[in-house]
Every structure is written in structure tokens, then in C-alpha cells.
């Protein structure tokens, strides 16, 4: 008999290349691949769960940064007066769910931020548990 | 035939809002389903394997605190002289194993510190390991 | 009808006890029933996908020290004149790639650095994506 | 005082190989990004190469990619430029920049000249 | 990949304003960063992100930057200012210079 094997983890890396001010990040997926989806540059949670999240990135201008999952509720990370970010953390997250980026610049510009090595993963914890697709 | 599903992984959150000086913190798990247990402000470890560990906290006061998982070994984490904390590690575990707080203060009051947004998380690693229930 | 176990999670620690100056560290899986394994003091890769990874020590020394996994690609990790480490991270690593460290010290002796407690945790975050043996 | 010196500048035949080299003291070069830029002789400055504090990234500018490498030493406070495939439009002066913020060219060195002749 | 035009020679009166330009597809989009350089020495930062002035560089360099070009200007120019000017942006983490613009004050 043939070992059951895993069904798919939910997983997603995602890179930004500019952050927009007073608005967010523009993310993309670079795998076709991946068991998440990115709609209107936020990564739908389909799985409820503990998240494994991971953020990297280097800016061109200082700035503050936060990462929200849900209106009214505080963010999963939050950067004040920052030129880079390399902060790893877990979050319970659950179906609804959306994981997007707002930005602050404290420049008088409103062009937009370049960054370089931007990346955002985030690692599904507790497969067996809700998820509607 | 239907694609297998995975058990649930042993995962918890627990809260805390106040620690006792020369003690622990007093642990309180908010959900029904979690897959792993509170006893004596302890969690109770059931599966040997590496666990993911989040530990975030704002004290009301200085104090350092170590998180303990086995008499006579170190310390899963040790902050000295801290008002807060926000730290992940991962750490291998293994049935019998209990996860406690010990608290101090480096004040002469002996009152309880309060603790805001107080939250440890434990996430087991490796499913399909030993487990005694 | 038993319900599906999880098959093993790609997981291993090592430890190490010294490095040598411009060259790597010397490491050791303390235990038999390690999941992944360990060739030419690299850490096989033999899964695709997302890696938990952490690494702790300390050094007699100051030193640089990068963990790599591919050639011609940028570190894991990368520690600049440090006495310590203790960090986390998130990486995607494949089939063929290797784990190993690279050390560098800024003394004139080119004795070896003994480290205290060294350790580095590696736990694949994908189970049931591409493995190969 | 900050110092950036590039070393590592010769003449070479077409078609052949140099590593470049440029020695940061005087500020934490690991916590610095850094680039490589280049100026023909007579001409305006290009771009050539990237590499941010991590050493995560790596960038080259259409003309090298494929030719050239950009590296680093964060232990020995060093950057790296390995030329191969050279040619005769590559003759410029090289000269290493940094920046605390990984746009901006805030220190650069007094450069090294790479002919490429027959 | 993105141009960046300058003109190759600009020159001004002594403590006069000299203007210096850059044109380049949607400039004002980018963030423009200019660099003096003197003969047989290397590049000085002088404005990044538009408009903004590194520490120790003298009030009268200033910088501007809307549609299709980005202006570096020199308000009562000074004999020390005679120099090559060049503008600089990034795209996606690739960077482009301008061809540079010689300034002569007179």
C-alpha cells in the first residue's frame, strides 16, 4: 500500500518592487505554483491557522510600514521610521482573511518607494484545519 | 477516493495578563480547540519534535523572565531586565515536558505585574513523530 | 478504518563546537534518527520548499560567519564581526542544494573558534511537494 | 575618515579576465549597500553592478551581465568586481560607491583603470 | 531601458542661477538623485530624492522634478562650481545616469 502523501501546504512568497505612500506595496508572485492567491495586491487566507510570516526588504527612503490582515483589527507587523525590515513572526489567521501592506513616508514626495529585496512569505502551520476555497 | 486529510497539528495560544514576582505568569488558553493543554499554568507537551515559539508581551514594569520547558535544563528563552518582549525561537520538545514562566522583578514591591497583549504561541513541527496522549 | 499518519517531516539538528578560520564549522548530528543528513559538513537538501531555519552560538572569538546553501547565491545568513547568534529565518531551498557555514575571523592566529552552544535547526515547511533520494 | 580604495585595475587582452578590488574602513560596511560604477575615458559615468548589504541581491546593467560579478566580504570590509570576457568597450575607470540607503551613492572611491587592448 | 538625457554643456554667469536639466520618459514618477564631479576626482552626492540636500552641501543646490524633467539648480553660482553634473535614477533595482552636463561659469 502506498504511504498517503501531503496534500499541498498553503504557502506563498511574494516580492515588491515599490511601495506606494499612504497607500501599500505592489506585490507579485513569481511561481505559478503557489497554494495562495494574490487578488488586489493582498494574499487571500482561505486556511483558518497559525501563519508563519516572514518580511524582508530594503527601502529607498525611510518610512513607516505595517502589514494588516483584517479592517478594525492591529496589524501583524508594524515598523515606524525604517530604511529596511527583517522581522519573522506567526499570526492565527483565518478564511476572509486578507494580508496587505500600508506605507507612510514622512518626505514631502508622494512618489513612490523603491525596494530592493522585498519579499513577503507566508507558511500555512496547521493543515487539517478549516479552509473554504 | 478521498485525498487524505492531515490530523491536526499540536498548536496553542495562550494569553497572559499578569505575572507574579518570584513565580510564573498566570496562562489562559482562549479557544476550546486547541490541540494541546493547560495544567498548572503549564503546557503540557505530548509529542516529542521541534516546536515553533512566539513569545510577545508588554510588561508593567522591568523584570526578566526565562520560559522553562524541563527541571534542570535552560531556559527556552531568557530576557533580563525587560519591559517587553517579542521573540520567536524554535526548540526541540518531548512528551512530559511542561512550558512554565519564572518571573522577577527588580522591584522591592512584590505586586503582580500587569501585562498587556501578553500571548505565547507553540506550533509542534514535526507530525508523524511520538505522541503519547 | 485507522486514520493517515503524517509520513517524517524533512527536519535535523546539528551541532558544532569549533569552526576554522576561512573555512566552515564542524558539525555533528547528535542524533540517529535525523531526517535529513549530513555530508562534507553540509546539510543535504533533498526536498523543495519553504525551510525553517535557526542558528545559535557562541563564539571565542569575534568573527564573520555566512550560512550558504548554493554557489553563486547570496547567504542564509550573514553575521558581521559578531560574538553570537541567535536568528531566525525563512528560506526556500531545492533538491541538490547544500546547507554549510563560512567563517571568517579578524585575528592574526588562525587557531580554531570554539563556539558554546552551537546549533543550527533545519525544518522543511512543505511536506508533499518534490523530494528526491 | 571614510575610505573607499579600488585596487585591481591593469591593462588586459580582449577576451581575458581581472577581479577588482575596494577596501571600506571608517564607516560599517556590512550595514552599507554597494555598487559599482564605471567612466570611459573623456565620458559620463555608467552604472555597472549592485549588491545590497545582505548580500541578497545582486543587479548588473545590460552591457555585463553575464560577463561580470559582484561580490562581497563583509568579514575582510571588501567588494568585489570579477571581469571576465572583456572587451575593448569596457576600458573606463571603475570606481566603488555606497549608501547607508540602498539608492544613494553617498561614499565612492577615487577609482582604478582597466584598459582593454590588444 | 530607461534614458536619461542631459544637455552636454551649460554655462552661467558668476553668481548667476545656472539651471541643469534631465529629461527622461515620466521622470517626475522617479525619484532623481544628481552628482557633482570634479576634474580627476569622483562623484559627490549633491541632491537625492528630488530635492533633497546631503549634509554639508552648500543651501544654493537645489533640485526639482515634475513630468518629463528633473532640474538641478545652482542659485548664485560660484567659480568652484564648474564641474560635470549628472542625474541618476533607479528602475526595479537597475540604476541609469544621465550623459552628464558640463557646467563653465563665467
Known amino acids: 500500500q502506498v504511504p498517503p502523501q501531503y496534500p499541498p501546504i498553503q504557502s506563498i512568497r511574494v516580492q515588491f518592487t515599490r511601495c506606494e505612500n499612504e497607500k501599500g506595496c505592489i506585490i507579485t508572485s513569481p511561481s505559478k505554483d503557489e497554494t495562495m492567491k494574490v487578488q488586489d495586491n493582498s494574499i487571500i487566507i482561505n486556511c483558518d491557522g497559525f501563519y508563519l510570516i516572514s518580511l524582508k526588504g530594503y527601502f529607498s527612503e525611510e518610512l513607516s510600514l505595517s502589514l494588516y490582515y483584517r479592517k478594525g483589527r492591529g496589524p501583524l507587523f508594524s515598523l515606524s521610521k525604517v530604511t529596511s525590515v527583517d522581522s519573522i513572526g506567526v499570526a492565527y489567521l483565518a478564511f476572509k482573511d486578507k494580508v496587505y501592506f500600508n506605507v507612510t513616508t514622512h518626505s514631502t514626495s508622494y512618489k513612490d518607494i523603491q525596494v530592493n529585496g522585498g519579499e513577503l512569505i507566508l507558511i500555512h502551520q496547521n493543515p487539517g484545519g478549516f479552509c473554504a476555497y | 477516493q478521498v485525498p487524505p486529510q492531515y490530523p491536526p497539528i499540536q498548536s496553542i495560544r495562550v494569553q497572559f495578563t499578569r505575572c507574579e514576582n518570584e513565580k510564573g505568569c498566570i496562562i489562559t488558553s482562549p479557544s476550546k480547540d486547541e490541540t494541546m493543554k493547560v495544567q498548572d499554568n503549564s503546557i503540557i507537551i505530548n509529542c516529542d519534535g521541534f516546536y515553533l515559539i512566539s513569545l510577545k508581551g508588554y510588561f508593567s514594569e522591568e523584570l526578566s523572565l526565562s520560559l522553562y520547558y524541563r527541571k534542570g535544563r535552560g531556559p527556552l528563552f531568557s530576557l533580563s531586565k525587560v519591559t517587553s518582549v517579542d521573540s520567536i525561537g524554535v526548540a526541540y520538545l518531548a512528551f512530559k515536558d511542561k512550558v512554565y514562566f519564572n518571573v522577577t522583578t527588580h522591584s522591592t514591591s512584590y505586586k503582580d505585574i500587569q501585562v498587556n497583549g501578553g500571548e505565547l504561541i507553540l506550533i509542534h513541527q514535526n507530525p508523524g513523530g511520538f505522541c503519547a496522549y | 478504518q485507522v486514520p493517515p499518519q503524517y509520513p517524517p517531516i524533512q527536519s535535523i539538528r546539528v551541532q558544532f563546537t569549533r569552526c576554522e578560520n576561512e573555512k566552515g564549522c564542524i558539525i555533528t548530528s547528535p542524533s540517529k534518527d535525523e531526517t535529513m543528513k549530513v555530508q562534507d559538513n553540509s546539510i543535504i537538501i533533498n526536498c523543495d520548499g519553504f525551510y525553517l531555519i535557526s542558528l545559535k552560538g557562541y563564539f571565542s572569538e569575534e568573527l564573520s560567519l555566512s550560512l550558504y546553501y548554493r554557489k553563486g547565491r547570496g547567504p542564509l545568513f550573514s553575521l558581521s564581526k559578531v560574538t553570537s547568534v541567535d536568528s531566525i529565518g525563512v528560506a526556500y531551498l531545492a533538491f541538490k542544494d547544500k546547507v554549510y557555514f563560512n567563517v571568517t575571523t579578524h585575528s592574526t592566529s588562525y587557531k580554531d573558534i570554539q563556539v558554546n552552544g552551537g546549533e543550527l535547526i533545519l525544518i522543511h515547511q512543505n511536506p508533499g511537494g518534490f523530494c528526491a533520494y | 575618515e571614510v575610505q573607499l580604495v579600488e585596487s585591481g585595475g591593469d591593462l588586459v587582452k580582449p577576451g581575458g579576465s581581472l577581479r577588482l578590488s575596494c577596501v571600506a574602513s571608517g564607516f560599517t560596511f556590512s550595514s552599507y549597500h554597494m555598487s559599482w560604477v564605471r567612466q570611459a575615458p573623456g565620458k559620463g559615468l555608467q552604472w555597472v553592478a549592485f549588491i545590497n548589504s545582505a548580500e541578497s541581491s545582486t543587479t548588473y546593467a545590460d552591457a555585463v551581465k553575464g560577463r561580470f560579478t559582484i561580490s562581497r566580504d563583509n568579514a575582510k570590509n571588501t567588494l568585489y568586481l570579477q571581469m571576465n570576457s572583456l572587451r575593448a568597450e569596457d576600458t573606463a575607470v571603475y570606481y566603488c560607491?555606497?549608501?547607508?540607503?540602498?539608492?544613494?551613492?553617498?561614499?565612492w572611491g577615487q577609482g582604478t583603470l582597466v584598459t582593454v587592448s590588444s | 531601458s530607461y534614458v536619461l538625457t542631459q544637455l552636454p554643456s551649460v554655462s552661467v554667469t558668476l553668481r548667476q542661477t545656472a539651471r541643469i536639466t534631465c529629461g527622461g520618459d515620466i521622470i517626475g514618477s522617479k525619484s532623481v538623485y544628481w552628482y557633482q564631479q570634479n576634474l580627476g576626482q569622483a562623484p559627490v552626492l549633491i541632491i537625492y530624492r528630488d530635492t533633497n540636500r546631503p549634509t554639508g552641501i552648500p543651501e544654493r543646490f537645489s533640485g526639482a522634478s515634475s513630468g518629463n524633467t528633473a532640474t538641478l539648480t545652482i542659485s548664485g553660482a560660484l567659480a568652484e562650481d564648474e564641474a560635470d553634473y549628472y542625474c541618476?535614477?533607479?528602475?526595479?533595482?537597475?540604476?541609469?545616469f544621465g550623459g552628464g552636463t558640463h557646467l563653465t561659469v563665467l
Open positions: 560607491a555606497g549608501g547607508y540607503i540602498w539608492t544613494h551613492f553617498d561614499y
Open positions: 541618476q535614477v533607479w528602475d526595479s533595482s537597475t540604476s541609469v
